[in-house]
Amino acid sequence: EEELQVIQPEKSVSVAAGDSATLNCTVSSLIPVGPIQWFRGAGPGRELIYNLKEGHFPRVTPVSDPTKRNNMDFSIRISNITPADAGTYYCVKFRKGSPDVELKSGAGTELSVRAKPSAPVVSGPAVRATAEHTVSFTCESHGFSPRDITLKWFKNGNELSDFQTNVDPAGKSVSYSIRSTARVVLTRRDVHSQVICEVAHVTLQGDPLRGTANLSEAIRVPPFLEVTQQSMRADNQVNVTCQVTKFYPQRLQLTWLENGNVSRTEMASALPENKDGTYNWTSWLLVNVSAHRDDVKLTCQVEHDGQPAVNKSFSVKVSAHPKEQGSNTAAENTGTNERNIYGGSG
């Protein structure tokens, strides 16, 4: 008598999540009499997937009618496949008895589930950095299968090369996750820049998923400060201007100091944006020269985005020989960031 064979013709089957999977199994003989059962996995922890005789298996249906005489096809169809269904499925023949006795197992069919990666999420650094510094961006995507996946980074459409990518777990799993960290060198022009993480996977049919992050969230462009005298007015008042240019973000506080004493504090708000995304701000201070007998030291103090304050100072020298009213005085830059204004006294 020929020995019974349990034939599982496919070593592996790959199915897209949501689809149905067909697991084929035929037996070479009708004898001995006894049921076929399907298991996922082997050993004492194996799970019963289908048993024609008893049990409720709502997602599993036999491919051919198991009740018809001389049936030797015990293939099953599992509907609405999810990544959790991945594993090795065994078709097992039992000999009828009390209880039934396991007789022969098929070689097993490995079911792998193709699952799309989640939309990539890109996160930037927790604190802002200035131009010429390198910042890290992280891209994460989860839940995909099979493990093979391609991830690319772009900055304003240009592909980046300085990144490290890990796919976890290392071994076989129902689904996988990818995490990549890219290093980006900032420039002052990056306020409007964007980094893009692009993920390509077999389940996406050539239409990769993208995640983006704006460098505006990561960059700080410190301001340039320039202090100038606008004019000497007829009433002996000097108009001093502090020009704060090319800064980002907008969060900025400006304080005028006269001889070290706070004169006025202002907060930047609702400023118009430059083409490059940075901001400019101008503040004026009127100094009554005739009210002072000694030189006046004016300081424009700017605190930007919580950083240490930056100062620019002027010395207004009170002279016995006033200059012609209405003329602009050229500000002479000294080595200490002080500018000298010679204002007339009368």
């Epitope: 082997a42 050993g43 922890g45 396991e102 197992s105």
Partner: antibody
Framework: QVQLQESGPGLVKPSETLSLTCTVS????????WSWIRQPPGKGLEWIGF???????FYQSSLKSRVTISLDTSKNQFSLKMTSVTAADTAVYYC????????????????WGQGTTVTVSS | DIVMTQSPLSLPVTPGEPASISCRSS???????????LDWYLQRPGQSPQLLIY???SRASGVPDRFSGSGSGTDFTLKISRVEAEDVGVFYC?????????FGQGTKVEIK
Amino acid sequence: QVQLQESGPGLVKPSETLSLTCTVSGGSIRDYYWSWIRQPPGKGLEWIGFIYYNGRTFYQSSLKSRVTISLDTSKNQFSLKMTSVTAADTAVYYCARVRAYSGIGLDGTDVWGQGTTVTVSS
Amino acid sequence: DIVMTQSPLSLPVTPGEPASISCRSSQSLLYSTGYTYLDWYLQRPGQSPQLLIYGGSSRASGVPDRFSGSGSGTDFTLKISRVEAEDVGVFYCGQALQTPLTFGQGTKVEIK
């Protein structure tokens, strides 16, 4: 080449909980059983229990009330927790991989960690 | 629980000579599928055990062919055709038919 590495404290006080972790590198958690086996000084091998990749656990009946084996597939690790330890729990603890090809039984414990010595003493 | 009993417990050997270890189980390890759930392990001094034989007679990967396993049901034998110096250590048989997995007491093989 699959490798297993046990980690955890070498000294545990009586009545406290012993916690060991086994890290699996170079291979997959799936389709295998992950076992803890111990060997008291100068004695033979004693199986503590194992966990299948699907999360099903099996324990030595005499230890069942004190032992928990868990699996973290994202980290490729599995762990042993043993409560209320006594001096009799002093042993070298091995983590190991057990194969299963088909059928109800198993096909050999084919990969072993190097073992970690745990001493129960106050 | 299935009880595994080994003999002898100590085995002095001569390099180049054959050696044999017996293992008996308290119930049959031959499953209805025809598979025998009996394994053999070697634990060299200061090392972890290593799998030599599984399924009663199948050699594990990388195991020299001087090791062979035989037997069926409840009586099993591990044979070393020509003992080498590196074969010293403790040999264990173990059953993998049902939980709890159980091991024999071990047979200590040492050079005469």
